[in-house]
């Protein structure tokens, strides 16, 4: 018997992927478990194999279709079950009715690029990936800039409260190496959370002109 807590958490990327994590204190690492998805108004069922990601945590992705296909809507309910093998049979360990558009986590923004860089400022753009057209413009972003001698955790967060896929960073130091990251979140969904941070974009400001401050 497991004495600690267990937790089953899933997020929908708004298109064709439900990512799930099952954690269970005291569970054996070599336990074989699966996630089963059973939608209420679709003809498909889907299963993925939970694979270890840490000492007592397993994860898998339910791939529902091609990356940009719209496989679920706000009225869908998907019953999700964790099934683990015990000897010769499968035993249900967790169950929930999952409302995809209440549990959103988008893919990290991609295609970050420097549009224009000067001594004290830099204009950066990016794209969102595999995001549903249902959101229209109802998205927000957070961005952060890594300055020399600091950590990402120390970087102040900049909030963009609209679907704006660019930013102009100001008050930068000339001839200095920086890194930049951005993440996205839909406004919809009670349990919706931020996407992972994008891959960092490295850039360098231009040196100050000779003879000037």
């Amino acid at each position: 018997a497991v004495n600690g807590t267990s937790r089953f958490t899933c997020f929908y990327n708004s298109r064709a992927n439900i990512s799930c994590v099952w954690s269970q204190d005291g569970a054996l690492q070599d336990t074989s478990c699966q996630v089963h998805a059973w939608p209420d108004r679709r003809r498909w069922n889907q299963t993925c194999e939970l694979l270890p990601v840490s000492q007592a945590s397993w994860a898998c992705n339910l791939i529902l279709g091609t990356p940009d296909s719209q496989k679920l809507t706000a009225v869908d309910i998907v019953t999700l079950r964790v099934m683990c093998r015990e000897g010769v049979r499968w035993r249900m360990m967790a169950i929930q009715d999952f409302k995809p558009f209440e549990n959103l986590r988008l893919m990290a923004p991609i295609s970050l690029q420097v549009v224009h860089v000067e001594t004290h400022r830099c204009n950066i753009s990016w794209k969102i990936s595999q995001a549903s057209h249902y959101f229209e413009r109802h998205l927000e972003f957070e961005a952060r800039t890594l300055s020399p001698g600091h950590t990402w955790e120390e970087a102040p967060l900049m909030t963009l409260k609209q679907k704006q896929e660019w930013i102009c960073l100001e008050t930068l130091t000339p001839d200095t190496q920086y890194e930049f990251q951005v993440r996205v979140k839909p406004l919809q969904g009670e349990f919706t959370t931020w996407s992972p941070w994008s891959q960092p974009l490295a850039f360098r400001t231009k040196p100050a002109a000779l003879g000037k401050d």
Partner: nanobody, 125 residues
Framework: QVQLQESGGGLVQAGGSLRLSCAAS????????MAWFRQAPGKEREFVGA????????FYADSVEGRFTISRINDKNTVYLQMNSLKPEDTAVYYC??????????????????WGQGTQVTVSS
Amino acid sequence: QVQLQESGGGLVQAGGSLRLSCAASGRTFSNYVMAWFRQAPGKEREFVGAITQTGRGTFYADSVEGRFTISRINDKNTVYLQMNSLKPEDTAVYYCSAPRSGRAGTRNQMDYEYWGQGTQVTVSS
């Protein structure tokens, strides 16, 4: 915050049936997985079964599978435990419980946040 109140317990002969009810108040009932646990004298509290938010999915402890059925009526904020073919070893205090809103139901009592006071079920031989 969710408040839970069980009812329907009592004394029944082996082989008989009983239906327990659990009335919920507070938050939106349909956001919660609901579960039943039981505790016999001198024993640990054990999982009986759980039902998903819409009632589409259920699962049960091996000891009650095929004899007990959990159902719910969200409009009435109530979950039920229908117990058939009762045995003396089913004697226990039965508790209704729920995890936090949006969380999955599991077999593990540590994962449940809200609990009723319990209702006594006694099965005589």
